[in-house]
């Protein structure tokens, strides 16, 4: 007996071939001997089966001695043995229809779990193997679960159902809802405008929800809410914003915040949360602000940084085109009695400059100029 595997909702063609390459009488029945369809001369005739409106054949193939039964919009309950009667012989085909669905929505928040459930006909014992977009394989029986979804799990999951040495492949598109970056750092000189961007790693037609940016300034004992906003069909509207600092927010995606000026009291780290409509849980992105200030007070040239810096970052003071006068893994460095010229304060990581501030030291009789 020939075995054919089908997918729920799909179309399947069950073949039946006669030895004579011409149109002759045939009919298809199910295991209960109920006629599904057949021919009467050149006409297609249908029986009283439950497949009536979903069964078809191809007249053009009859002349080649092929008499297919085509079943559209397959259901699990279409799993049966189908019998083709042609030329006084019977061909049996066992059709097994499977369905694979994601238990929840296919749009899941980062960190959530994905459960895939296999629908199968009674008496079958299939095995399932799924491959994620990042190449991770998971195996199971009726259900497969993946916990702690990551951004790289977004995309097409390919699942293979095996039964009777035959296989059928399912493709399920999973969208992991997350920000493109889990964390970002912005380095700014004191007084500069600060741009924070929070691009999403997914696109959906309609995006509705609400969000908030909480900020923990390095100098503050507790965190505070800087801004709250709503998102409606990808349009952003601010609900509430602090007076200090007075953040501005872009009206369109990606989420975009502007801090008019970087000041030491704002240096620190923030957490932007986004709660999406009809989703439990929130999206998070951490953002950090590092602020640099270079000053000369009397005979002391000082460079300071505020905010979350890694211990391996180097802070240096150097006279332009000369070797660094001072270079330390600290958040403040200074030079006493600096010579006149353009001094550079540099914050660097393994030789790569992250932030630079220039200060002009004038001969001792005049006051310093900050460009």
């Amino acid at each position: 007996k020939k075995v054919v595997l089908g997918k729920k909702g799909d179309t399947v063609e069950l073949t039946c071939t006669a030895s004579q390459k011409k149109s002759i009488q045939f009919h298809w029945k199910n295991s209960n001997q109920i006629k599904i369809l057949g021919n009467q001369g050149s006409f297609l005739t249908k029986g009283p089966s439950k497949l009536n409106d979903r069964a078809d054949s191809r007249r053009s193939l009859w002349d080649q001695g092929n008499f297919p039964l085509i079943i559209k919009n397959l259901k699990i309950e279409d799993s049966d043995t189908y019998i083709c009667e042609v030329e006084d012989q019977k061909e049996e085909v066992q059709l097994l229809v499977f369905g694979l669905t994601a238990n929840s929505d296919t749009h899941l928040l980062q960190g959530q779990s994905l459960t895939l459930t296999l629908e199968s006909p009674p008496g079958s014992s299939p095995s399932v193997q799924c491959r994620s977009p990042r190449g991770k394989n998971i195996q199971g029986g009726k259900t497969l679960s993946v916990s702690q979804l990551e951004l790289q799990d977004s995309g097409t999951w390919t699942c293979t159902v095996l039964q009777n040495q035959k296989k059928v492949e399912f493709k399920i598109d999973i969208v992991v809802l997350a920000f493109q970056k889990a964390s970002s750092i912005v380095y700014k000189k004191e007084g500069e405008q600060v741009e924070f961007s929070f691009p999403l790693a997914f696109t959906v037609e309609k995006l509705t929800g609400s969000g908030e940016l909480w900020w923990q300034a390095e100098r503050a004992s507790s965190s505070k809410s800087w801004i709250t906003f709503d998102l409606k069909n990808k349009e952003v509207s601010v609900k509430r914003v602090t007076q200090d600092p007075k953040l501005q927010m872009g009206k369109k995606l990606p989420l975009h915040l502007t801090l008019p000026q970087a000041l030491p009291q704002y240096a620190g780290s923030g957490n932007l949360t986004l709660a999406l409509e009809a989703k439990t849980g929130k999206l998070h992105q951490e953002v950090n602000l590092v602020v640099m200030r270079a000053t000369q007070l009397q005979k002391n040239l000082t460079c300071e940084v505020w905010g979350p810096t890694s211990p391996k970052l180097m802070l240096s003071l150097k006279l332009e085109n000369k070797e660094a006068k001072v270079s330390k893994r600290e958040k403040a460095v200074w030079v006493l009695n600096p010579e006149a010229g353009m001094w550079q304060c540099l914050l660097s990581d393994s030789g790569q400059v992250l932030l630079e501030s220039n200060i002009k030291v004038l001969p001792t009789w005049s006051t310093p100029v900050q460009p």
Epitope: G6, K7, D10, T11, E13, S42, D56, R59, S60
Partner: antibody, heavy 115, light 107 residues
């Protein structure tokens, strides 16, 4: 709802090979036959041939010697190659889904053969 | 090959008119016939199959009839959206063949 999207070279020189591909989105690829049809002002609508998921083909005898239709089930795509083209092959080429009737069509690709 | 001949090749009519297009097969094709509507720059669209069955979404003013060699497509009350070219197609045997088309124009 099934959608067919097609693409390929639009301008050919005589004797070259026409090559078009059609991708099927949002519907069952199995169980159907996938056809190529062309439409020219001179000959109207002309069925070129078809293929199914298993790679079984049927061709129009008038074009059979020059036509190859192939399938890539991993991508739900099928392709048409028509060799040794002449000006008479200038037409709009459509891909379509069929059991007996062409119930879904691609957007069409204008192919011009000119020296 | 089965030849499909449509008549008339063009017809002028007004909104609200009843229009009939005929299609004749060079040999019997039972009811293995479909009708398509095509608008300029667009792909044909299936209207009627099995000679008289409606494709989903097709307005009920369209109807098909016939069997064997002679078939008709009738539009009971023309709407502005119906001005297009109509084709018949046989699915009885390879190669599938189409009629040459009937252009329905506004009078």
């Amino acid at each position: 709802q099934v959608q067919l999207q097609q693409w390929g070279a639009g301008l050919l020189k005589p004797s070259e090979t026409l090559s078009l591909t059609c991708a099927v989105y949002g519907g069952s690829f199995s169980g159907y036959y996938w056809s190529w049809i062309r439409q020219s002002p001179g000959k109207g609508l002309e069925w070129i041939g078809e293929i199914n998921q298993s790679g079984s083909t049927n061709y129009n005898p008038s074009l059979k010697s020059r036509v190859t239709i192939s399938v890539d089930t991993s991508k739900d795509q099928f392709s048409l190659k028509l060799s040794s083209v002449t000006a008479a092959d200038t037409a709009v080429y459509y891909c379509a889904r069929v059991i007996n009737w062409f119930d879904s069509w691609g957007q069409g690709s204008l192919v011009t053969v000119s020296s | 090959d089965i030849q499909m001949t449509q008549s008339p090749s063009s017809v002028s009519a007004s909104v609200g008119d009843r229009v009939t297009i005929t299609c004749r097969a060079s040999q019997g094709i039972s009811s293995w016939l479909a009708w398509y509507q095509q608008k300029p720059g667009k792909a044909p669209k299936l209207l009627i199959y099995d000679a008289s069955s409606f494709q989903s979404g097709v307005p009920s003013r369209f109807s098909g009839s016939g069997s064997g060699t002679d078939f008709t497509l009738t539009i009971s009350s023309l709407q502005t959206d119906d001005f297009a070219t109509y084709y018949c197609q046989q699915a009885n045997s390879f190669p599938y063949t189409f009629g040459q088309g009937t252009k329905l124009e506004i009078k």
